[in-house]
């Protein structure tokens, strides 16, 4: 089974702008269940030197708190280092700038490292469009539909848009 | 484009050991997570252990205390080194550059059996 893995065409900046999280998925069912560390909702990106800026969305206390990250760039031209709960390798494996974004971590957090997949999309009514790419790179990287959470609005922070 | 290639497999009693090796080429091999999985005859192909870029590392419950995962950033290599195999442990072993997760390799055959 071979393949290319997608990079964004363009350039990063074409990442930019706000994105809606659809669905995660996880080997630690911790990480992605409510108050899990990784039960994060994207708001936004921005690519500045070839590094991403993102704001997420976390739920904390019934209301939902805004954080900006920085995954910066590496040798590796799919791969940024983030800091977040520990350091994670943060991979893009498929990307649509103008419809939806793939990516996935191995989060180092003390002694622990796992791995966490994120679907986001532009457009939410969308969002079944892309679950099978989805389905597909968490098939490859070794995470099974059962470990995928679809997350409803309710989920995801709506509320707590601009 | 990236290539693995997967050694060191083979026949095995239980309660044996076995070290897997994988050559990465085509990657920045210090730079990138790596991993190996395994696929037994009619199941899904699962996850064993992974490495970070960083050596952290994490095995599946079932192999825990048994099955160790390892880098040589120098040689381009990743290692699993199994002890106590059990029959259940047969399978196709695959390792995984995180960077390219659509590439496999042609995988190493690991069989316990009396």
């Known amino acids: 089974q071979e393949g290319n893995h997608e990079e964004p065409q363009g350039g990063l900046e074409e990442l930019s702008g706000r994105w809606h999280s659809v669905a995660l998925a996880s080997n630690k069912s911790d990480l992605i269940k409510p108050w899990g560390h990784f039960r994060v909702f994207i708001h936004s990106m921005s690519a500045k030197d070839g590094n991403l800026h993102g704001d997420i969305l976390i739920p904390q206390d019934g209301q939902c708190e805004k954080v900006s990250l920085t995954a910066f760039k590496t040798a590796t031209s799919n791969k940024f280092d983030l800091e977040y709960w520990g350091h994670n390798d943060l991979y893009l494996a498929e990307v649509d700038p103008k419809s939806y974004l793939i990516l996935y971590m191995i989060n180092q957090y003390n002694d622990d490292t796992s791995l966490v997949a994120h679907l986001m999309v532009r457009d939410l009514s969308r969002q079944q469009d892309f679950l099978p790419a989805f389905e597909s790179v968490c098939e490859d990287i070794g995470l099974h539909k059962d470990q995928i959470v679809v997350l409803s609005d309710d989920d995801r922070c709506q509320g707590s848009r601009d | 484009e990236v290539q693995l290639v997967e050694s060191g497999g083979g026949l095995v009693q239980p309660g044996g050991s076995l070290r897997l090796s994988c050559v990465v080429s085509?990657?920045?091999?210090?730079?990138?997570?790596m991993g190996w999985y395994r696929q037994a005859p009619g199941k899904q192909r699962e996850m064993v252990a992974i490495?970070?870029?960083?050596?952290?590392?994490n095995n599946v419950d079932s192999v825990n205390g048994r099955f160790t995962i390892s880098r040589d950033n120098a040689k381009n290599t990743v290692y699993l080194q199994m002890n106590s195999l059990k029959p259940e442990d047969t399978a196709v072993y695959y390792c995984?550059?995180?960077?390219?997760?659509?590439?496999w390799g042609q995988g190493t055959q690991v069989t316990v059996s009396s």
């Open positions: 490495i970070s870029s960083v050596g952290t590392t």
């Open positions: 085509g990657s920045i091999f210090s730079d990138n997570a």
């Open positions: 995984k550059d995180f960077s390219a997760p659509r590439y």
